[in-house]
Interface confidence: medium
């Protein structure tokens, strides 16, 4: 069966300063490929983490996905500031050259709250 | 207080079609996704359709895709469910659901409208 | 598709009774869980959500628990209007959402 990109919340708020995270869990990791996440959709959006070696300041991982049998792809966000806002997309790719998007999460739109 | 008012139900032949509309009052419609949910009699709450605020994403359950389109006007308050290609496996109570602002529950409900399709 | 089985199809009890109702996922949905009640000519009320939260003027009489695929609904002493029937609904996974078989509470 389709690997299934699940983004239980459809939304959360979160206060400028404080940190919040952005749930995603995978059906299987197979195809074998990266998980991205991303801020927006089409041409304009924009990576906001990716589950490699690349470094992302503010933004980590929750669980650690270099364990094989870990499906839990969720991130933190920290410090969060209000340019933060916006949705939020948990994207499962197949590997390849270059990698092929092959299912995405719903969304998860961050509210971003006046301290 | 959130009211939602299911109205349009009635008794039609299969093949034939019917408009189910919700009136909601309340809340601030156009911020809430929206679901049709129905039972049949003596049966089990059976989810149908869900439409966002915007009405920009639409799901259907795989029992009336192709069949039911699900809409909303905001100006006006209402949800609508315009039902084509009735079957007697569609004779169900239909009910109107509010979902949470965060989750696919549902936090509000109609009193539902009643469905049915007899030859 | 996630399938939600609910567990007794009938439970016969006096008021004052302990009401214990199980509801068993296909596969995980973490605590993305809700109950509703089901009385007759009115409309399905949310009891809890988050498995174990209840919703606002739900009466503390009233208490959910369990993750993953095993989830309990508890009605810690019946009181007439209890008697109704009760679903369990998952919304971790995306639409189709799903809701179990239900389970009728009955007065003996």
């Known amino acids: 069966t389709e690997v299934k990109v699940i983004q239980p919340e459809k939304s959360v708020s979160v206060a400028a300063g404080d940190s919040t995270v952005l749930n995603c869990t995978l059906t299987s990791l197979l195809p074998v490929g990266p998980i991205r996440w991303y801020r927006g959709v089409g041409q304009s959006r924009q990576l906001i983490y990716s589950f490699t070696t690349e470094h992302f300041p503010r933004v980590t991982n929750v669980s650690d996905a270099t364990k094989r049998s870990n499906l839990d792809f969720s991130i933190r966000i920290s410090n969060v500031t209000p340019e933060d806002a916006g949705t939020y997309y948990c994207v499962k790719f197949q590997r390849g050259s270059p990698d092929t998007e092959i299912q995405s999460g719903g969304g998860t739109e961050v509210y971003v709250l006046a301290k | 207080d959130v009211q939602l008012v299911e109205s349009g139900g009635g008794v039609v032949r299969p093949g034939e079609s019917l408009r189910l509309s919700c009136a909601a009052s309340?809340?601030?419609?156009?911020?809430?996704?929206m679901n049709w949910v129905r039972q049949a009699p003596g049966e089990g709450l059976e989810w149908v359709s869900l439409?966002?605020?915007?009405?920009?994403?639409?799901y259907y359950a795989d029992s009336v895709k192709g069949r039911f389109t699900i809409s909303r006007d905001n100006s006006k308050n209402t949800l609508y469910l315009q039902m084509n290609s009735l079957r007697a496996e569609d004779t169900a109570v239909y009910y109107c659901?509010?979902?949470?602002?965060?989750?696919?529950?549902?936090?509000?409900w109609g009193l539902g409208t009643l469905v049915t399709v007899s030859s | 598709e996630t399938v939600l089985t609910q567990s007794p199809g009938t439970l016969s009890l006096s008021p004052g009774e302990r009401a214990t109702l199980n509801c068993r996922a296909s596969?995980?949905?973490?605590?993305?869980l809700a109950w509703y009640q089901e009385r007759p000519g009115q409309a399905p009320r949310l009891l809890i959500y988050?498995?174990?939260t209840r919703a606002t003027g739900i009466p503390d009489r009233f208490s959910g628990s369990g993750s993953g695929t095993e989830f309990t609904l508890t009605i810690s002493s019946l009181e007439s209007d209890d008697f109704a029937v009760y679903y369990c609904?998952?919304?971790?996974?995306?639409?189709?959402?799903?809701f179990g078989g239900g389970t009728k509470v009955e007065i003996k």
């Open positions: 309340g809340f601030t419609f156009s911020s809430y996704d």
């Open positions: 596969q995980s949905v973490y605590s993305y």
């Open positions: 988050g498995a174990s």
């Open positions: 609904q998952q919304y971790y996974d995306r639409p189709p959402l799903t």
């Open positions: 439409i966002s605020g915007s009405g920009e994403i639409i």
């Open positions: 659901a509010k979902e949470n602002n965060r989750y696919r529950f549902f936090d509000d």
